[in-house]
Interface confidence: medium
Amino acid sequence: NKILVKQSPMLVAYDNAVNLSCKYSYNLFSREFRASLHKGLDSAVEVCVVYGNYSQQLQVYSKTGFNCDGKLGNESVTFYLQNLYVNQTDIYFCKIEVMYPPPYLDNEKSNGTIIHVKGKHLCPSPLFPGPSKP
């Protein structure tokens, strides 16, 4: 059995920032889970991770240089991305894995959200010299 994920088809980020909400057909309350956001049609870049454990504080991090924060709802995770570059306009996919309690669950691949960055032309960091290619 797979978790279903709903995302907006497109979000426009005028000021290099955007809130992307991932809505799940599953209640995350009192669950240990790992929600992540991935860039590109091939999901090659893991943009941001939200790790939730019923006994600990929410952990939000990016290992790929994105400035991100996360907010947890009962059946959603919202990723707040800041300092996006125009050349990071791409399609972004929500992913969810529930580790506890058993059984392990993950999601059907979602339709993705095109994030259209229309803000200031910031200079990308060395981590992101250009867009990902499928």
């Epitope: 979000l11 426009v12 980020a13 306009t89 791409d90 339709n111 095109i114 867009p131």
Partner: antibody, heavy 125, light 107 residues
């Protein structure tokens, strides 16, 4: 006036190459999402490729590895480089602009709002 | 990929009559469906986006409805210039896909 004008079509042998051009006026190609579509004789429309404003490019499975979409910012022109052409690539090719606007956090996508007149590609020996 | 099936393939009507065109998706596309008009030798023209919103400059006789898997384009009173082929297109799932078209011809 906002418009797109395609060129570069013609007759080519199977296995050959062509480069289609799509010159834009009245708006900036590089700040828009631009796609190529095609329409085989007597058939419906098929999406071929897209280039996002950020430069990311994607392709239909039927052309992946053979076609390359690109743009020249100062010439305000979109291109489609077509290699290893097959008879099933015979079609009228259109470039089109994705109509997108909105405010922070909102998406407003309203379909392909500007189309070129089309250029005919015939692949035959 | 999502398959869009349009019906009927051909619609034979007279000017002034009402035209009802159908587009059915193989799975839900929510409201992310557009309609285009194409005349012979011309590029497509956007009529309706997001199922029910008229594009700029499109006359009020064109209207769209539906959500999920079933959509309808209605032309309330056909004008001579409305005889053309109409395509639906979804943007809910990758890749974007079109229906095979409905030809509206003069009876």
């Amino acid at each position: 006036e906002v418009q797109l004008v395609e060129s570069g079509g013609g007759l080519v042998q199977p296995g050959g190459s062509l480069r289609l051009s799509c010159a834009a006026s009245g708006f900036t190609v590089s700040s828009n999402f631009m796609s190529w579509f095609r329409q085989a004789p007597g058939k419906g429309l098929e999406w071929v490729s897209v280039i996002y404003s950020g430069g990311s490019t994607y392709y239909a499975d039927s052309v992946k590895g053979r076609f390359t979409i690109s743009r020249h910012n100062s010439k305000n022109t979109l291109y489609l480089q077509m290699n290893s052409l097959r008879s099933e690539d015979t079609a009228v090719y259109y470039c089109a602009r994705h109509g997108i606007t909105g405010t922070t956090g909102d998406y407003y996508y309203y379909g392909m709002d500007v189309w070129g007149q089309g250029t005919t590609v015939t692949v035959s020996s | 990929e999502i398959v869009l099936t349009q019906s009927p393939a051909t619609l034979s009507l007279s000017p002034g009559e009402r035209a009802t065109l159908s587009c059915r998706a193989s799975q839900s596309v929510r409201s992310y469906l557009a309609w285009y008009q194409q005349k012979p030798g011309q590029a497509p023209r956007l009529l309706i986006y997001d199922a029910s919103n008229r594009a700029t400059g499109i006359p009020a006789r064109f209207s769209g409805s539906g959500s999920g898997t079933d959509f309808t384009l209605t032309i309330s009173s056909l004008e001579p210039e409305d005889f053309a082929v109409y395509y639906c297109q979804q943007r809910s799932n990758w890749p974007p896909t079109f229906g095979q078209g409905t030809k509206v011809e003069i009876k």
